[in-house]
Each structure stands twice: as structure tokens, then as C-alpha cells.
């Protein structure tokens, strides 16, 4: 029988607001036996896949978005989902990353450490096979 | 019940390049990382190599260039390019069963004899 | 380049006793750590996988445990069928690093 796949969670570090020109790295976690992470933008035709996927501790694995250089166009919601043979599981929540310039006045907001969204309950859509490009400027990686 | 079944094995002379075949039976194989081991007689286990769903490759830095993995949407190959006698082993492939998981459905073997 | 180094290469030990098998990495893994259980003849099989989990149908007299570069596998109340040899694996195939599998032990049951 198939089992139920859990929801996955979504987190960026260092926050979700970020400096224009600054780093950003999108997390997606997931179960035990993922093997593709799927980071998309609001809109499902624009995603980007990794199967660069490691097991973070014994109950969680994780794979890492990168992008390297923030612009106003990556402002947004992401989300992730997760390919665990032979099923895709349902989107995390939205996370949305907001992009500030560096004015670097007393008003300006700090970076929010850890900002993450993680699973509750909405509508299932099973709906991820449609093939898109890859988002722009987004890269998979993974740290150690 | 999910299997895998390696082919292709069989005595060869040094040089001769030999391919060696995966298929899977109760299970798509074109959804999943594959990997190959191999075994050579009284030693220990040796990871060749991956290849993922999307048709990407890994490999050990010591199978680098004496071996190339490919895949069809049925099979997954193993080409042995210039063999010589210490490729002499067992040939195992393995389905990749994700994140932590590993190379947890193996097949039975194919043995592969370099010989002149 | 990653490596797993497995100690002791070989071990005896009476029924009913207990073995426990290390496996080092030479950089940290995070919990990408599998265990496998290889007879004679055989394909492995797999005992243990991200690190302390036990794969369907073992019994839980195989416990796995560990994080980072150092890991065990402890087999208690040892069984015949226990004689085998005792593989770790990384099992981490990304863009970092490849895995790979230890040197192995072989567990001989008095």
C-alpha cells in the first residue's frame, strides 16, 4: 500500500528579508527516502527541481536553493514539494521573501533570522508533472 | 513483489569492453536513482557509480572514466570501457531508494571474468 | 574524498553476546548512513538506513545509532544466522560529495 506523504516545510536563511544584491538560500525539508525537491514560485510553471538531497537527521532530509544575488524579481511567495517515488507530495505553505534596498538607514529593518513556513492543512494538488524552465537566478546546492 | 535482475555477464579478454544490464520488474524503473556495486571474489563491497532519474551520473573518483552508466526508460547499463583483470567481481545493481536510504533493492548479481 | 572506515575487520563472538561494529567518516554525513548484512552467495541486505532506522522485517536486535563522522551498529542476543559480513554505507550521492561503502567486518558466531 502507499503511504501518506507528509506536507513539506520551507525556511530561508539568512531571513526572508534581504538586501538587494545580497545571498538568500531557500530550505526544504522533508521525509525519510525524498529524491527530488521541488522549489516553486507562486506559480507552478516556474520551479526549480534538485536532486541533490541529503538526510539532515534520521527523520528529516533537506535540500538547499540558493540565490546568489537578490533582485527585485525574486521577490515573492516560494513553496516546496518533494518526489518520493512513485508520488509527489502536497506544497508547503508559501514563504514570502521580500527584497529591500540598501539604503542602510536607522529604519531600515534587519534581516529576519530563520524564517520558515511549515506544513498545516489546505487542499491537496496533485497536480506537479507539467514541465517548466528552471526559475531565474535560483540554483540548487547543497552545504556542509 | 519489486525486483531488480543484472545481464551481461560473462568471460572476457582484457581490453574488450563489456555491458552489463539492469532491469526492473514490479516497479518503474525510469522513476528512481539507480546504482551499481560490485564485488570482487573475497573482498568487499565497491560503489561504482548513480544514475539519477534525470539521467545525471556520480561516480567514484577511482571508476571515473573506466566506467559509464546510462539509462533507457527500461533499462540501466553498465559499460565496462577497457576492462582489465581487476575488474574481475560480481556486478550488483541496486535501486536507490532516496534520501538515507541508499541502494536498498538489489539484484542477484552478474558475474564478470577478465581473462586472456 | 569521502571514506568510511569500519572497525574491527573481523570479530568472534558466542550466541547470545553482543558485537558492535564502527563506522568512521572522514567528514561529517549529516544521518546519510545505512547498514547492510551480506552471507555467502548473496546480495546485501539492508539492515538499518539514516543511521537508526530499521528496514522492513529486521529484527530489533539490530540497533543503529550515531551523527556526523561517527556511527555503530549493534547487534545483541546474537543468533547463528547472525554470521555475516556487516557493511556501512554513505548514502548521500549529491553535488558535495559521493558515498560509498565501508571496508565491511565479518562477524563469526562461536
Known amino acids: 500500500q502507499e503511504e501518506d506523504l507528509p506536507r513539506p516545510s520551507i525556511s530561508a536563511e539568512p531571513g526572508t528579508v534581504i538586501p538587494l544584491g545580497s545571498h538568500v538560500t531557500f530550505v526544504c525539508r522533508g521525509p525519510v527516502g525524498v529524491q527530488t525537491f521541488r522549489l516553486e514560485r507562486e506559480s507552478r510553471s516556474t520551479y526549480n527541481d534538485t536532486e541533490d538531497v541529503s538526510q539532515a537527521s534520521p527523520s528529516e532530509s533537506e535540500a538547499r536553493f540558493r540565490i546568489d544575488s537578490v533582485s527585485e524579481g525574486n521577490a515573492g511567495p516560494y513553496r516546496c514539494i518533494y518526489y518520493k517515488p512513485p508520488k509527489w507530495s502536497e506544497q508547503s505553505d508559501y514563504l514570502e521573501l521580500l527584497v529591500k534596498e540598501t539604503s542602510g538607514g536607522p529604519d531600515s529593518p534587519d534581516t529576519e533570522p530563520g524564517s520558515s513556513a511549515g506544513p498545516t492543512q489546505r487542499p491537496s494538488d496533485n497536480s506537479h508533472n507539467e514541465h517548466a524552465p528552471a526559475s531565474q537566478g535560483l540554483k540548487a546546492e547543497h552545504l556542509y | 513483489e519489486q525486483s531488480v535482475e543484472e545481464s551481461g555477464g560473462r568471460l572476457v579478454t582484457p581490453g574488450t569492453p563489456l555491458t552489463l544490464t539492469c532491469t526492473a520488474s514490479?516497479?518503474?524503473?525510469?522513476?528512481?536513482?539507480m546504482c551499481w556495486v560490485r564485488q570482487a571474489p573475497g573482498k568487499g563491497l565497491e560503489w561504482i557509480g548513480l544514475?539519477?532519474?534525470?539521467?545525471s551520473t556520480a561516480y567514484a573518483s577511482w571508476a571515473n572514466g573506466r566506467f559509464t552508466i546510462s539509462r533507457t526508460s527500461t533499462t540501466v547499463d553498465l559499460k565496462i570501457t577497457s576492462p582489465t583483470s581487476e575488474d574481475t567481481a560480481t556486478y550488483f545493481c541496486?535501486?536507490?531508494?532516496?534520501?538515507?536510504?541508499?541502494?536498498?533493492?538489489w539484484g542477484p548479481g552478474t558475474l564478470v571474468t577478465i581473462s586472456s | 574524498e569521502l571514506v568510511l572506515t569500519q572497525t574491527p575487520a573481523s570479530v568472534s563472538e558466542p550466541v547470545g553476546g553482543t558485537v558492535t561494529i564502527k563506522c568512521q567518516a572522514s567528514?561529517?554525513?549529516?544521518?546519510?548512513l545505512a547498514w547492510y548484512q551480506q552471507k555467502p552467495g548473496q546480495p546485501p541486505k539492508q539492515l538499518i538506513y539514516?543511521?537508526?532506522n530499521l528496514a522492513s522485517g529486521v529484527p530489533s536486535r539490530f540497533k543503529g545509532s550515531g551523527s556526523g563522522t561517527e556511527f555503530t551498529l549493534t547487534i545483541s542476543d546474537l543468533e547463528c544466522a547472525d554470521a555475516a559480513s556487516y557493511y556501512c554505507?554513505?548514502?548521500?550521492?549529491?553535488?558535495?560529495?559521493?558515498?560509498?561503502f565501508g571496508g565491511g567486518t565479518e562477524v563469526e558466531i562461536k
Open positions: 541496486a535501486r536507490y531508494g532516496g534520501s538515507g536510504i541508499g541502494c536498498n533493492l
Open positions: 514490479g516497479f518503474t524503473i525510469s522513476d528512481y536513482h
Open positions: 544514475i539519477r532519474a534525470s539521467h
Open positions: 567528514q561529517s554525513i549529516d544521518s546519510n
Open positions: 539514516a543511521v537508526s
Open positions: 554505507e554513505c548514502t548521500y550521492y549529491g553535488n558535495s560529495y559521493v558515498g560509498g
